[in-house]
């Protein structure tokens, strides 16, 4: 592989690494969306909620003079409950219905697939760099692109979950905004998907420049 190509691959891998960090952050944190109730709902405090793939947290926040609920970073009494995805016999203490359990199960499962693709892609990259097997960058690029797509699907499932929670008559939440975990997931999708495609492009052998050349005449790989 030529020096310029190697440089392009390294820059791409750096972008993919940033995507991996963002994806991991999004998956393990629970600030995908912040939900708030009617402002008149409480006199001095309001009960906002923020949630992720694994749990929902409610927080009693002191209301300011502008009668707004938040920001969620303000100190307050916090109550978190994990979605019991994989032990259906047990029920979550709070918000069993209102969290749209089937949506969070789907989003969490797809996010795990995404992490699986990231691990497979990273293994291929490590083997490629360690043993100079450039051809392993091609499956790695595909794994990263698939990981990006899985993150995108998780994002869309969570968007639908938020919409249903806001629309549901069985919740008090009336307003919402997407928070930093959601932003991390969106950025991770862009970096992983585009990074994967770029890596695939840079790891392909040089196409013949002249009609009489064949792929066999291209620069040999290590």
């Amino acid at each position: 592989m030529s020096q310029t190509k190697m440089l392009k691959v390294r820059v791409t891998l750096f972008c993919i690494l940033a995507g991996i960090v963002l994806a991991m952050t999004a998956v393990v944190t629970d600030h995908w969306a912040v939900l708030s109730p009617h402002m008149e709902h409480h006199n001095t405090t309001c009960e906002a909620a923020h949630f992720g793939l694994w749990r929902i947290c409610t927080k009693r926040i002191p209301m300011d003079d502008s009668k707004t609920c938040g920001p969620i970073t303000l100190p307050g009494e916090k109550n978190c409950s994990y979605f019991r995805h994989f032990n259906p016999g047990e029920s979550s203490e709070i918000f069993e219905f209102t969290t749209q359990k089937e949506y969070s199960i789907s989003a969490a499962a797809i996010a795990i697939f995404s992490l699986g693709f990231i691990i497979l892609g990273s293994l291929c990259v490590l083997l490629s760099l360690g043993k100079k097997r450039d051809y392993l960058l091609r499956p790695a690029s595909m794994f990263y692109a698939f990981a990006g797509l899985c993150i995108l699907v998780s994002v869309e499932v969570m968007r639908q979950s938020v919409k249903r929670m806001i629309d549901s008559e069985d919740t008090v939440w009336i307003e919402y905004y997407y928070s930093w975990s959601f932003a991390c997931a969106c950025a991770a999708f862009i970096l992983l998907f585009l990074g994967g495609l770029a890596l695939l492009l840079f790891s392909l052998p040089r196409m013949p420049r002249n009609p009489w050349e064949s792929c066999m005449d291209a620069e040999p790989e290590h």
Epitope: H38, M39, I94, F95, E169, D170, V172, I174, E175
Partner: antibody, heavy 116, light 108 residues
């Protein structure tokens, strides 16, 4: 399918306390919000207030000083108490599932007349 | 509190005709959080529309909702005999929740 049924006296004397109970069947009272509404004869509906199964409640400011909503999870029931009633409190009282949005599941309603 | 005014008070139409019911709010309703109900005498209200335009489960597609801000409309495209009832609007954009006085749709 969740079903709600209101019960209580149909006649209450002025200045006394109106007490109604809503029994929920077909679903657990847990994890949901439960609301009381009323409709005076020939008039529109009025939201009274709601309670969460944990016991936290919120009321219409116009009735807040007179109203108490409580919940009994063991009996799958929630109740309404309205103090110092007058003829203006004569209405069909409904219980419903939900809190501060729209209401899909309603009881059949019970007419309460305030008269001496 | 938000006051909802429904017009007309009574609407006289024939089966098969189109009914247009209006609900006007005294101030803007946040996020178009408005619901429509149908109420038969001696029965509890039945949810038709929520979020100004979303049809509730099992509601026929002849019922549709539209509008935003302060002006909202419930349209029944072709009136069926069972549609001649009272219709109420309800806002849930701010507390306290409030309801309109209702529009009675009667057979001409």
């Amino acid at each position: 399918q969740v079903q709600l049924q209101e019960s209580g006296p149909g006649l209450v004397k002025p200045s006394e306390t109106l007490s109604l109970t809503c029994t929920v069947s077909g679903d657990s009272i847990n994890n949901y919000y439960w609301t009381w509404l009323r409709q005076p004869p020939g008039k529109g509906l009025e939201w009274i207030g709601y309670i969460y199964y944990s016991g936290s409640a919120n009321y219409n400011p116009s009735l807040k000083s007179r109203v108490t909503i409580s919940v009994d999870t063991s009996k799958n029931q929630f109740s309404l108490k309205l103090n110092s009633v007058t003829a203006a409190d004569t209405a069909v009282y409904y219980c419903a599932r939900g809190a501060v949005k729209y209401f899909r599941h309603w009881g059949q309603g019970t007419l309460v007349t305030v008269s001496s | 509190e938000i006051v909802l005014t429904q017009s007309p008070g009574t609407l006289s139409l024939s089966p098969g005709e189109r009914a247009t019911l209006s609900c006007r709010a005294s101030q803007t309703i946040n996020h178009n959080n408005l619901a429509w109900y149908q109420q038969r005498p001696g029965q509890a209200p039945r949810l038709l529309i929520y979020g100004a335009s979303n049809r509730a489960t099992a509601i026929p597609d002849r019922f549709s909702g539209s509008g935003s801000g302060t002006d909202f409309t419930l349209t029944i495209s072709r009136l069926e005999p069972e549609d001649f009832e009272v219709y109420s609007c309800q806002q849930y954009g701010s507390l306290p929740l409030t309801f309109g006085g209702g529009t009675k749709v009667e057979i001409k």
